[in-house]
Interface confidence: low
């Protein structure tokens, strides 16, 4: 049975086996086409989601689709139902929390009262002044809190207490990539992790431990990537994995927050990377213990210099490392998070590509998560 499962796939109606290598090859080998059903699927970027959260205290903003202008949500008459609608528009299914925060002196958007129309937030037509003088601060999910704060050093062994959202993504029980828990159903990782194996069956997620082999594996229901853009082959290196059963959160299994849409990190901002990747550039061996390292944002202009990445780093990517080198992510860390701590931890980047590991001024290149919030929300909404 184990051998059969490893090398063959069972088609239904009529029952017969086909070689496993014929799964997800673009050809319908089973009469009903089920060999092409459980495969990595692409999902278009989709329409603009009409709500977003700002780094200014996680305040809610709503899009006026008629004018294309964004407005800040006034706290007047804002209800739990409206909070749930806002979060559902972003694809969240959990119970949100919200509170009033004072309108700041540098508030640059018009503030409007919010209502609901066919399960979408709208601006109230006859919106007068915001009498409460407050904006809506909204949290769709409790995220980005860990039991332990890491110490700022070069590279050291990590504890799952510090990074409860880190997962190992495995194919046939072998660690292939890192990933981050975003909510009970969803894990964020890199699309290039699935280049070799596009069938969903053999992919598993392991969560809740900092040791590679020591935790139970979770079945994957779907793997979703963005449509490939041949003009920018390294762009869109982002994937979402939907778990078959929702995770139960605990001290060692928790979600990390998505970044705010306006999360612009300036050069030298401190960030963290983690992973079980190779400890030496040319192979070495996979680390059994989760490793963590502090790095910093490296200016994209410097990163794109003609003696560096020569313009290959697009606006949907970001660079991070340390100026004197020696700290970087490496093969096997792909898909893992590049993290920023404000009040909570946010996954601002996904380990994507780079040349060599830990080279002086040779930063890692990361998928900029804030550039893909719209896509993430659209995927989640489609799967609600």
């Amino acid at each position: 049975k184990v051998i059969l499962d490893k090398y063959y796939f069972l088609c239904g109606q009529p029952l017969h086996f086909i070689p496993r290598k014929q799964l997800c090859d673009g050809e319908l080998d089973c009469p009903l086409g089920e060999d092409e059903e459980h495969c990595v699927k692409s999902f278009p970027e989709g329409p603009a989601v009409a709500v977003r959260l700002s780094k200014d205290r996680s305040t809610l903003q709503v899009l006026d689709s008629a004018t294309g202008n964004w407005f800040s949500a006034c706290f007047d008459n804002f209800t739990e139902a409206l909070a749930e609608t806002a979060c559902r528009q972003m694809g969240y299914s959990s119970k949100p929390t919200f509170r009033a925060v004072e309108i700041g002196p540098d508030q640059d958007l018009d503030v409007v009262e919010i209502t609901e129309n066919s399960q979408e937030l709208r601006m109230r037509n006859s919106s007068g002044p915001c009498l409460s003088g407050s904006l809506v601060s909204l949290h769709c999910l409790a995220c980005g809190k860990s039991l332990k704060t890491p110490r700022v050093v070069g590279v050291e062994e990590a504890s799952v207490d510090s990074w409860p959202w880190q997962v190992s993504i495995q194919y046939d029980k072998q660690h292939v990539c890192g990933g981050s828990i975003l909510d009970p159903h969803w894990v964020l990782t890199a699309a290039h992790c699935f280049r070799k194996h596009t069938d969903v069956f053999n992919w598993k997620v392991r969560a809740g431990s900092d040791k590679l082999g020591s935790f139970p594996s979770l079945a994957v229901a779907k793997i979703i990537i963005i449509e490939f853009n041949p003009m920018y082959p390294k762009d869109n290196d982002i994937a979402l994995m939907k778990l078959q059963f929702p995770l139960t959160f605990s001290g060692t299994v928790r979600p990390i927050c998505l970044p705010f849409f306006d999360e612009e990190l300036t050069p030298a901002t401190p960030l963290w990377i983690i992973g079980w990747g190779f400890t030496k550039q040319n192979g070495g061996k996979m680390s059994d213990i989760l490793l963590q390292a502090s790095v910093q944002v490296i200016d994209s202009t410097r990163c794109n210099a003609d003696d560096a990445y020569q313009g290959e780093v697009t606006e949907k990517m970001m660079c991070a490392g340390i100026p004197e080198g020696g700290v970087d992510t490496c093969q096997g860390d792909s898909g893992g998070p590049l993290m920023y701590q404000s009040d909570q931890w946010h996954v601002v980047g996904i380990v994507s590509w780079g040349y060599g590991c830990g080279g002086p001024s040779t930063p890692g290149v990361y998928t900029k998560v804030s550039a893909y919030l719209n896509w993430i929300y659209n995927v989640w909404k489609a799967e609600l």
Partner: antibody, heavy 120, light 107 residues
């Protein structure tokens, strides 16, 4: 200004090992990769490998794998290249060369070269 | 490994001539190509990096062009001090291979 000063010429017997040093000055030693390139008499240039002086990680050309070891001593800003099991075809001038700043960048600064002669 | 093929292997020219040396990579190397000049008994000297960027201090009569697999080094007006051997080198992938060299001699 940037300077790379290499150790003096060596004459070695076949089967022996040689260790060439390259002392760097005029810049932050740990911020730039150091490459080793050799040139046999009357021949072209041959890239041997590279060391990251910050972490000490290395990448060697397959041809030299198992015979070459590149190390560094940050306290003296010196990199070393040791080649073992020497044979006559290893007779060459060995150069250390500093990258312009990135792993894949061109070699902007070169040492004066060290002639290693292997006699049988 | 990526093979780098230079042509010609040697060439004779006179002072004032315009000279072109080509370098072909066995696979695409984007713009990861450098050109070096070497004189007898001396270490190589970097002329051009990133296929077309002139290293500071190098005279503007030297120029580089190309991307992908085909690259060119051009000396617009040969000077007496330009007679030397020229090498191309790819740094797209380790090992960072060199071309076999082009010896530029006085006619």
């Amino acid at each position: 200004q940037v300077q790379l000063v290499q150790s003096g010429a060596e004459v070695k017997k076949s089967g022996a090992s040689v260790k060439v040093s390259c002392k760097a000055s005029g810049y932050t030693f740990t911020s730039y990769y150091m490459h080793w390139v050799r040139q046999a008499p009357g021949q072209g240039l041959e890239w041997m490998g590279v060391i990251n002086p910050s972490g000490g990680t290395t990448s060697y050309a397959q041809k030299f794998q198992g015979r070459v070891t590149m190390t560094r001593e940050t306290s003296t800003s010196t990199v070393y290249m040791e080649l073992s099991s020497l044979r006559s075809e290893d007779t060459a001038v060995y150069y250390c060369a500093r990258g312009r700043g990135w792993l894949r960048s061109a070699l902007g600064y070169w040492g004066q070269g060290t002639l290693v002669t292997v006699s049988s | 490994d990526i093979q780098m093929t230079q042509s010609p292997s040697s060439l004779s020219a006179s002072v004032g001539d315009r000279v072109t040396i080509t370098c072909r990579a066995s696979q695409s190397i984007s713009s990861w190509l450098a050109w070096y000049q070497q004189k007898p008994g001396k270490a190589p000297k970097l002329l051009i990096y990133a296929a077309s960027t002139l290293q500071s201090g190098v005279p503007s009569r030297f120029s580089g062009s190309g991307s992908g697999t085909d690259f060119t080094l051009t000396i617009s007006s040969l000077q007496p001090e330009d007679f030397a051997t020229y090498y191309c080198q790819q740094s797209y992938n380790t090992p960072y291979t060199f071309g076999q060299g082009t010896k530029l001699e006085i006619k």
